[in-house]
Structures are given as structure tokens and as C-alpha cells.
Interface confidence: low
Amino acid sequence: QNLFTKDVTVIEGEVATISCQVNKSDDSVIQLLNPNRQTIYFRDFRPLKDSRFQLLNFSSSELKVSLTNVSISDEGRYFCQLYTDPPQESYTTITVLVPPRNLMIDIQKDTAVEGEEIEVNCTAMASKPATTIRWFKGNTELKGKSEVEEWSDMYTVTSQLMLKVHKEDDGVPVICQVEHPAVTGNLQTQRYLEVQYKPQVHIQMTYPLQGLTREGDALELTCEAIGKPQPVMVTWVRVDDEMPQHAVLSGPNLFINNLNKTDNGTYRCEASNIVGKAHSDYMLYVYDPPTTIPPPTTTTTTTTTTTTTILTIITDSRAGEEGSIRAVDH
């Protein structure tokens, strides 16, 4: 056997090159046949009425043919025949790759409660061979469950991801990434997770600066409440007592001028948003006017309440971003 060919893999719509090579030539006729065993070329003559086949090279040692605008129907075995005695035959297999036509993420629901499992589906349509779908949450790879549907030699792959959502997922993209031999680099689409959570409350003493509250001094407390959405209500209350008459409330700030011992107690900043409520307590102790040995400073304690965290999903589809996954992993 001195007739050789090589298998060809080509992307749909591109050009396939078929080569029949003879090692020891004796000027025998070389013929190329299609999968239906119709003659495409007999030496340098093309009897087949398909102008997509063009002769690239013809000699006693090689018949080289190009096939333009390859379609999936062109797939199969192409036969090279060498008219020696006895005749020799070798075949080359043309494999046509079809990239996925479309990549879509479908989310079961727009909002989800933290701790709940949501279903995310990604579909890569009409590819050949079947597409491999990979899932990432940020830079962490997750496992999806894929189902393949075949129709007319083409494959539609749907991958289902069951994702348990957490507050920490806020702003993290869920990425559906496609790997396919007909796609250079990574084809991907993603959704950014937006997590809503109850406020986190922190009280800061902005006056006095040294943190020691004495009779006759002024006190200024600022309540910082961070949540998503931003807390709509920030209120000050005095726990188990009325707010002093000389206390001034201004938004997140609490001012108490001319402190006296009757002001001792716990002052609570409460914040709420649509998700839930939280609070932080400041325990005020008013000390005597200055002495030689300063007593210990006042303390702040924070308490939060158990509430529900909501997740909202915002769409942001991007395709063909290469190298976007490697960057970070933990």
C-alpha cells in the first residue's frame, strides 16, 4: 500500500482540503470519490457537477482538492483510488464541526431568598458535536447537569445548575461557558447576582474625640447603616426609657448637650429596609468631671436580628471573552 490520505476536520462554511498522495509513483491514474462513491476527480478532470470542488494540485504523486463552503451534508468518507494492479484504495474522513448557534441563560426566577436553591439553565443550540457547558460562580467552577437533544445530526445541549444563593454572592457573575472544537477561545454568557440583605448597623462616637463622656460635656453619635437596598429608615431610641429632652435627633446623628447622670442608659440605632431590621446599641455612662485617674472608656455593642435576604438577578450576556476565567481561583 503506497496510497495515503489524512482525515480532515473543518468548520461548517469553511474550506476542506483533501489530499491523495502516492509514495512510489508509476504514473497510475488517481481518482477521488465522494461518500456516495461518485467520482469527483479522475486525474485532473472533474466529472461531478459541483463547482465547490477545485483542483489545487495534480501530479503523478498527488491529487489535492479543495471543497469550499462545507456543509454538514458533505461529511463522510472520501475515497482515493490508485489504478494500479491490483487497484489500491484509501479513504479520508471529513468531519464537519458546527459551532453552537446561540447561547442563552434562563433563570427560574428573578429574585430568590438567601439559602434557597435556584435553577439556572444554559442552552447551546444546534452544534456538532455536542457542546460542553461549564459553569462558574465568579472564578469557582460549579457542576451542572447536562441533557443532550439530537436532531438531524445536530445537538442542542441544556445544562441545569442548581445554585444555592448567599449574601456573599452579591455582584458575583454566574457564567455559562461553552467549550466546542469549532469555537476559538471561550464563548460565554453571564448574569450578575445582586443580593439584597438587611442593614448592618454601626454606631460611631464623633464627639468627644477621646471617647470619655463626662458631666457637662456634649455627646454626638453617628449611626452608620449599610444594607441593600440602602436602609430607608434610621431611627434613634433610648432602650427602656424616654429620650432626654435636651437630645437632638438629626437624621443618623444623635446630639446630647450638657450631659448629666440621668442620661445614663442604652441608646439604640435601628435601621430597616425592605429585607429586614437590625440595630446597634450604645451604652452611655456619664462620668464625674475630670479626676487624676481616668476610668475605662464606654463600650458599643452590636446586635442584629434574623431576617430574610433577597437576591435579584441582573442580565449581562457576553460572548467570546477569552481568558476571563483563569484569573482568579480559591
Epitope: 467552577e141 483563569r326 484569573a327 482568579v328 481561583d329
Partner: antibody
Framework: EVQLLESGGGLVQPGGSLRLSCAAS????????MYWVRQAPGKGLEWVSS????????HYADSVKGRFTISRDNSKNTLYLQMNSLRAEDTAVYYC?????????WGRGTL | QYELTQDPAVSVALGQTVRITCQGD??????ASWYQQRPGQAPVLVIY???DRPSGIPDRFSGSTSRNTASLTITGAQAEDEAHYYC?????????IFATGTKVTVL
């Protein structure tokens, strides 16, 4: 040759500090997340810390959080682990490892 | 906090098949990888992505996962396969976790 080579291990008193280094060669260091994994004598493997390819993100096991610091110098192809406030239970062979979401290359370790 | 559990030790006759299992809830969500560690040596990756084998790893090593259990199978165990095998995955925060490991003895 693709390899990782750790150094910097040694004997240290409780409360002391050590800095481990891991020199990478034979691959594009700046493209890979890197890790430290340790193994106490006669025990199993324990993940210690991770760092992203750029160095922008770091993660630590609870057992070392606040005491150990992972860092990298991509211009020198080197990974570091600064270990402070060392305890007897930190005694182990420390391996540096490379990978995406699994460890596909390991160093020989430093004790 | 997720945990992975493996049998501490398993024995196999030379040329026979041995299956090591690793159980944990994280295996429902995250890929498992398996590492071989011979005495006095660094670990070596033998299986990743549940069932993919790195180049250079003999095809007698294979992996699979069903629900919360990952398995490493050595078909036709050789003397050089005697080692500790560790399963690795992620916890709920995405941090790596290793199982305690299984010592495989080839008889």
C-alpha cells in the same frame, strides 16, 4: 522543565515567624492561581491558602487566618507565605501547588 | 462547613480492582479531584473534574461521581500504586477541602 521548588522551612520557637518561598519555572507563572497546602507529620493534606493569578485575591483556612499572609511576585515567578505567631500545630511539610480548580503541579515541600 | 470522608485503608491483590470512595455534600456541587501520595513524596494529581485523567497517568485509574459520592477506581492494581489517595473538593465558601485519605496496600 515545569517545576515548583519550596524553601525557607526550619525550626522556630512558638510565637516566632518564618517566610516560605516557592520558585516556579517552566510555565507562565502569572497565568495561574497558586496555593499552599500543608501536611503535619503522619497526617493528611490540609489546604492553607490561595492567591489569584494577579495576586488581587487571597483566601485562608480558618486555622491560619490572621497569622499567615500569602503573596506573589510575578516578575520573579515566586510565591510566598509569611507565617507569624507560629504554633506547635503549624509543624508540617508545606507544599506549594499550581492549578485552576485543582492542583495539577506540586513542589517537593519544605519542613 | 462541608467535610469529605474516606475509608482509612483498603487492600487489593496485585492485578485486581480496587475502588476508593469519598463522601460529602460538596460533591453534589463541586468537582472532585484525586491525589496519589507515595511515602516521602509530594502528591500527584491522578483524576480531576470527577473523571478526567491528566496526561501521564495510566488508564487503569478512573473516576466517577454519583450524587454525594466520588469514586476512584484502580483496575489491575500494580505494586507502584501502593500509596495514600486523597479526595479534594470545595466547601460552601469555595475553599478547598481534603478528605482524610485512604491508604491503599497492594498485596
Amino acid at each position: 522543565e515545569v517545576q515548583l521548588l519550596e524553601s525557607g522551612g526550619g525550626l522556630v520557637q512558638p510565637g516566632g515567624s518564618l517566610r516560605l518561598s516557592c520558585a516556579a519555572s517552566g510555565f507562565t507563572f502569572s497565568r495561574y492561581p497558586m496555593y499552599w497546602v500543608r501536611q503535619a507529620p503522619g497526617k493528611g493534606l490540609e489546604w492553607v491558602s490561595s492567591i489569584s493569578s494577579s495576586g488581587g485575591l487571597t483566601h485562608y483556612a480558618d486555622s491560619v487566618k490572621g497569622r499567615f499572609t500569602i503573596s506573589r511576585d510575578n516578575s520573579k515567578n515566586t510565591l510566598y507565605l509569611q507565617m507569624n505567631s507560629l504554633r506547635a500545630e503549624d509543624t508540617a511539610v508545606y507544599y506549594c501547588a499550581r492549578g485552576d480548580w485543582y492542583f495539577d503541579l506540586w513542589g517537593r515541600g519544605t519542613l | 462547613q462541608y467535610e469529605l470522608t474516606q475509608d482509612p485503608a483498603v487492600s487489593v491483590a496485585l492485578g485486581q480492582t480496587v475502588r476508593i470512595t469519598c463522601q460529602g455534600d460538596s460533591l453534589r456541587t463541586y468537582y472532585a479531584s484525586w491525589y496519589q501520595q507515595r511515602p516521602g513524596q509530594a502528591p500527584v494529581l491522578v483524576i480531576y473534574g470527577d473523571n478526567d485523567r491528566p496526561s501521564g497517568i495510566p488508564d487503569r485509574f478512573s473516576g466517577s461521581t454519583s450524587r454525594n459520592t466520588a469514586s476512584l477506581t484502580i483496575t489491575g492494581a500494580q505494586a507502584e500504586d501502593e500509596a495514600h489517595y486523597y479526595c479534594n473538593s470545595r466547601d460552601s465558601s469555595g475553599n478547598h477541602i481534603f478528605a482524610t485519605g485512604t491508604k491503599v496496600t497492594v498485596l
